[in-house]
Each structure stands twice: as C-alpha cells, then as structure tokens.
Amino acid sequence: QRLSRAQQQLPLESLGWDIAELQLNHTGPQQDPRLYWQGGPALGRSFLRGPELDKGQLRIRRDGIYMVHIQVTLAICSSTSTSRHHHPTTLAVGICSPASRSISLLRLSFHQGCTIASQRLTPLARGDTLCTNLTGTLLPSRNTDETFFGVQWVRP
C-alpha cells in the first residue's frame, strides 16, 4: 500500500519496520557457545533500527512477524569438521530469554562445508532475546561478507 506524505516523513521505527543487520564481534569464553554480535555505521554495513543489542545478543523491541536470517562461515574449516576428528559443528538460533519463551528457531549443521546460511519467518515479541549458538571448537570468520545475522519486521 502507498504511504501518505506524513507517513513518509516518520522514522521507520514508528512505522513498525524494525530491522537490524549485525556482524560478528567475538565468540564466547569457555563453556559459552554463543556468538556475540555488533552493529553500527562506524563498523561498516551493519545497523540497528529498532532492535537493540544486549551484551552482544539481539533483543526485539516490537511485536510482529520477522524474517530472521543468518550466515556463518568457519575460519577454521576442515573436510572432516563433521566427521571423525570433531564433534559435529552446528549453529542454532533461538529465543533464549525470557525463559518462558525459550525455543529453537533455526538449526543448521556444517556437513563438510565451510558456510551455512538460512532464513525463516517467525513471530517475535517485545523483549525476546535471540541467541546464536555455535557448538564445537571451530572458529567462525569475522569477515563481514562471510558472517552476518539480521532480522526484519514484516507485519504485525
């Protein structure tokens, strides 16, 4: 539908078009499989318009149906990454807090490949914090064209 002139002058956040695109900051310490993200114009092609970062995890500020997308490339990647020398390396995206809404949204495995990518539509609520867990010992790339994570509000 077409926007009125007044709507066109409103910031995207007020229209409900929350959106974020993040780049990898760092991996967690021992026993913490989470990936920690960062975003902002000073960092390059990453940004947050509505959602916010809480200790490197993405927090939703508006209810709605969102497109969630992620790509992760391994900087330490072997043809045997998922076989005899390693526990299978998997990436899981889920709501990790609040605990009452904890659920896995995406789960992907590196099957003798160095990159995984996926997206899905899913309802998210204000206050939901999304965590991205990378199991195993392998190290993800921080190149911004290889590893990124984002959400886009689609509709209420």
Epitope: H26, T27, G28, P29, Q30, Q31, D32, A75, I76, C77, S78, S79, S81, C114, T137, L138, L139, P140, S141, R142, N143
Partner: antibody
C-alpha cells in the same frame, strides 16, 4: 607497536614437559585469535595450535593433539602452550603469532621464537 | 591436509632483477586463502601477502601475489638487497593451515 615475546624454551628429556609463554603488547590482546607455529631445524614451518580471543575455542594439529594445551590469560596479555609427553620430533623453534582480525589463521605479527630441544 | 610445493628450491639472482616464485597446492585452496611470508636467518617470518594478492600493511609494491585454485605466484619486480631471504607460502582455507617449505632467493 605490536610486540610478541616468547619464553620458556629449553632442553627437556623425552617424555618431559615444558610450558611456553608469549607476552603480547601494542594491541588489544583479547580481540585476536592467537596461534603457536613451530619450525624444526632446517625444516618447514608447521602450525601447532590456535585459540580464540576469548579463549573459549581451541584447535590443534593432529601431531600434538592430546599432548599440548593452548591457553591464554587476557588479564595478563599472555598466551601459553603447555607441552607434555614431549618427543624428539617436537624439537623446534616455537613462535607465537597473531591472527588477522578476520580470525583466519594467517599471521600478521610473529614473536622472535623460543627454542625447545627434546633430547636425552 | 593440503600439501604446498614450492619451486624452485633456490633462486640465484642479482639486485634489480625480477623474481618469480611458485607455490602449488595438492588441492584447490578455498577462496584463494593463501599467504606469503619472508624469513631471514634467525628471524621470525614477516607477512607479505594474504588472500593470494593483497599486500600486508607496510609491504612495498614491488611485492605482488597472483594465482587461484592450486597455482600461486609471488613476484618481486626488482630485487633490493634486503629482499634476499627465504619465502614461504601458506594456505589457510582448509584446516589444518599448512606451509610450503620455502624458496631461497640468494644473491648470484
């Protein structure tokens, strides 16, 4: 100026242990993955082990897996390599090396190395 | 693991000449993730090139890298006295990262 200074090398008998240290300065140590790379006398360079910036992820060459342990203390800007069950073929100069920001294991800065000799 | 073979083993040239060093991989190097290092006796290696063709910070433009897949080349357009050293290639696209055994560039 980035500086990496290894220490802890020396002469050790087969089956013995040694702990190498690498003191880092001139960069935000906790931001970068680090590796140990070795070079036996007159031989090629050989990557040994790496550790992520936070210390939560480690990776080893098959030749040292189960015998060597890499670790780091970000509060002290120091990288370590604990070497157990040493063999004659572990004799080499051991370098600590800083990864590029991307995490990929190529090395933009190296220490001067410390010599480990395993001999009876 | 990927085996890197460097040739020639030794290159005897005079200052001002062009040096062409080869590095061949036993299988294709992912995303051309190949680096070149310079090493002088008793010193640590020094990064020259990464990603097959990108010069590292502070490296003079007489050093250039090229190639893709399994065949890579380091070229020194005009040898300076300080360039006589051993040059090693390294692939970091597939784990474990591996090094070639080096080409020695010596004064003729």
């Amino acid at each position: 100026e980035v500086q990496l200074l290894e220490s802890g090398g020396g002469l050790v008998q087969p089956g013995g242990s040694l702990r190498l240290s690498c003191a880092a300065s001139g960069f935000t140590f906790s931001t970068y993955a680090m590796s140990w790379v070795r070079q036996a006398p007159g031989k090629c360079l050989e990557w040994v082990s790496l550790i992520s910036g936070s210390g939560g992820r480690t990776y080893y060459a098959e030749s040292v897996k189960g015998r060597f342990t890499i670790s780091r203390d970000n509060s002290k800007n120091t990288l370590y390599l604990q070497m157990n069950s040493l063999r004659a073929e572990d004799t080499a100069v051991y370098y600590c090396a800083k990864h590029d920001y991307s995490n990929y294991p190529y090395f933009d800065y190296w220490g001067q190395g410390t010599l480990v000799t395993v001999s009876s | 693991e990927i085996v890197l073979t460097q040739s020639p083993g030794t290159l005897s040239l005079s200052p001002g000449e062009r040096a062409t060093l080869s590095c061949r991989a036993s299988q294709s190097v992912r995303s051309n993730y190949l680096a070149w290092y310079q090493q002088k006796p008793g010193q640590a290696p020094r990064l020259l090139i990464y990603g097959a063709s990108n010069r590292a910070t502070g490296i003079p433009d007489r050093f250039s890298g090229s190639g893709s897949g399994t065949d890579f080349t380091l070229t020194i357009s005009r040898l300076e006295p300080e360039d006589f050293a051993v040059y090693s290639c390294q692939q970091y696209g597939i784990s474990p990262p591996t090094f070639g055994c080096g080409t020695k560039v010596e004064i003729k």
